[in-house]
């Protein structure tokens, strides 16, 4: 059932990276507007993005309250200019989203190599600990704060003169690797949550190479 000349939203899709979470849907509205509601499985519905002509709604503020909860959203369709109008069953047309559990499903954003420092034949590579929109005690938590040891980083490193990529892993944000003296190396990192079955890996960080300004070399 529904209101004359309104169509139900479809293709409801969660787009989420490092917990920044947007619900998207179709179609682009023609003579209609949308309102979104979100709820946990056991909670009450909360309305967001009231009577919007957008086909997306930022739900970050709601999901960051508890990223381990499972959320459900629904998109209501109303005739433009007559938002009080309801369908024959007494309620506006709506469509449910798939369930979404941020902790398990948010995409890992592209990491950044913060710095690297060579001391003799060792190189320390540090990955930037990206800030998320998840809050605790009024401070924003980093990705490491949220995921703890569930988050690991894989470092790919290679001699500038060769193509084979060696790997190292860390469950902190730092790597200490052995390198050959007098060789320049390039680095790229990838964030991984090994316990996941989907959305396990980030895209690779931009490549950083020795001899560029991010690095520091110390001979001892």
């Amino acid at each position: 059932s529904g209101t004359t000349n309104t169509v139900a939203a479809y293709n409801l899709t969660w787009k989420s990276t490092n917990f920044k979470t947007i619900l998207e849907w179709e179609p682009k509205p023609v003579n209609q507007v949308y309102t979104v509601q979100i709820s946990t499985k056991s909670g009450d519905w909360k309305s967001k993005c009231f009577y919007t002509t957008d086909t997306e709604c930022d739900l970050t503020d709601e999901i960051v309250k508890d990223v381990k909860q499972t959320y459900l959203a629904r998109v209501f369709s109303y005739p433009a200019g007559n938002v009080e109008s309801t369908g024959s069953a007494g309620e506006p047309l709506y469509e449910n989203s798939p369930e979404f559990t941020p902790y398990l499903e948010t995409n890992l954003g592209q990491p950044t190599i913060q710095s690297f420092e060579q001391v003799g034949t060792k190189v320390n590579v540090t990955v930037e600990d990206e800030r998320t929109l998840v809050r605790r005690n009024n401070t924003f938590l980093s990705l490491r704060d949220v995921f703890g040891k569930d988050l690991i980083y894989t470092l790919y490193y290679w001699k500038s003169s060769s193509s084979g990529k060696k790997t190292a892993k860390t469950n902190t944000n730092e790597f200490l690797i052995d390198v050959d003296k007098g060789e320049n190396y390039c680095f790229s990192v990838q964030a991984v949550i090994p316990s996941r079955t989907v959305n396990r890996k980030s895209t690779d960080s931009p490549v950083e190479c020795m001899g560029q300004e991010k690095g520091e070399f110390r001979e001892i």
Epitope: T154, K165, T167, A168, S188, P194, T197, K201
Partner: antibody, heavy 120, light 107 residues
């Protein structure tokens, strides 16, 4: 159910080529790293190389460097081991194995293996 | 490359015996060591990961421990199905390397 199935093994002459396949099911290879490991008759396990299908990065053991190439086709969810300039010492059962890229776990699933015999 | 020196290369034991296999890494590998069991004509199976953690579905008679760069696999009470070859592996750095294997045979 997670499964890895190797194929393509057989008898090949020294100097010849062979391409092995590792077909994965129950998971998406681009979410993992795929390794090749071999075992000569009556011998131990020897690591051959790996590919990260999400970025194409590879690395090879010294004995096969320049002769073997690992690739992946994510649309087919399959990894490959192209073996060129084969030698008698490459005779082995070749396994592919899944690496969850964990700080803790190494190779959690292995294929059943495919036998490559290099002989004239 | 990191060498994993495994010993003994073979041992004979009886059902119910306590069996210990050791592996020494040539340099620090943190806890990035796994143990595998392999039976003839079959692929290796993961037993122990991160030096001391039992992999899912593996009987509790298997255990692993670490002391510095020395790693130990222990079978507390050998069962008939445990006669096999066991390998250690470090995955701390590329290339990952295996020990030479220990064949556990029936006495």
């Amino acid at each position: 159910e997670v499964q890895l199935v190797e194929s393509g093994g057989g008898l090949v002459q020294p100097g010849g080529s062979l391409r092995l396949s590792c077909a994965a099911s129950g998971f998406t290879i681009s979410d993992y790293v795929i390794h090749w490991v071999r075992q000569a008759p009556g011998k131990g396990l020897e690591w051959v190389g790996y590919i990260d299908p999400s970025n194409g990065y590879t690395y090879y053991a010294d004995p096969v460097k320049g002769r073997f190439t690992i690739s992946a086709d994510t649309s087919k969810n399959t990894a490959y081991l192209q073996m060129n300039s084969l030698r008698a010492e490459d005779t082995a059962v070749y396994y592919c194995a899944r690496d969850p890229q964990s700080f803790y776990i190494a190779f959690d699933y292995w294929g059943q293996g495919t036998l490559v015999t290099v002989s004239s | 490359d990191i060498q994993m020196t495994q010993s003994p290369s073979s041992l004979s034991a009886s059902v119910g015996d306590r069996v210990t296999i050791t592996c020494r890494a040539s340099q620090d590998v943190n806890t990035a060591v796994a143990w595998y069991q392999q039976k003839p004509g079959k692929a290796p199976k993961l037993l122990i990961y991160s030096a001391s953690f039992l992999y899912s579905g593996v009987p509790s008679r298997f255990s692993g421990s670490r002391s510095g760069t020395d790693f130990t696999l222990t079978i507390s009470s050998l069962q008939p199905e445990d006669f096999a070859t066991y390998y250690c592996q470090q995955h701390y750095t590329t290339p990952p390397t295996f020990g030479q294997g220990t064949k556990v045979e029936i006495k």
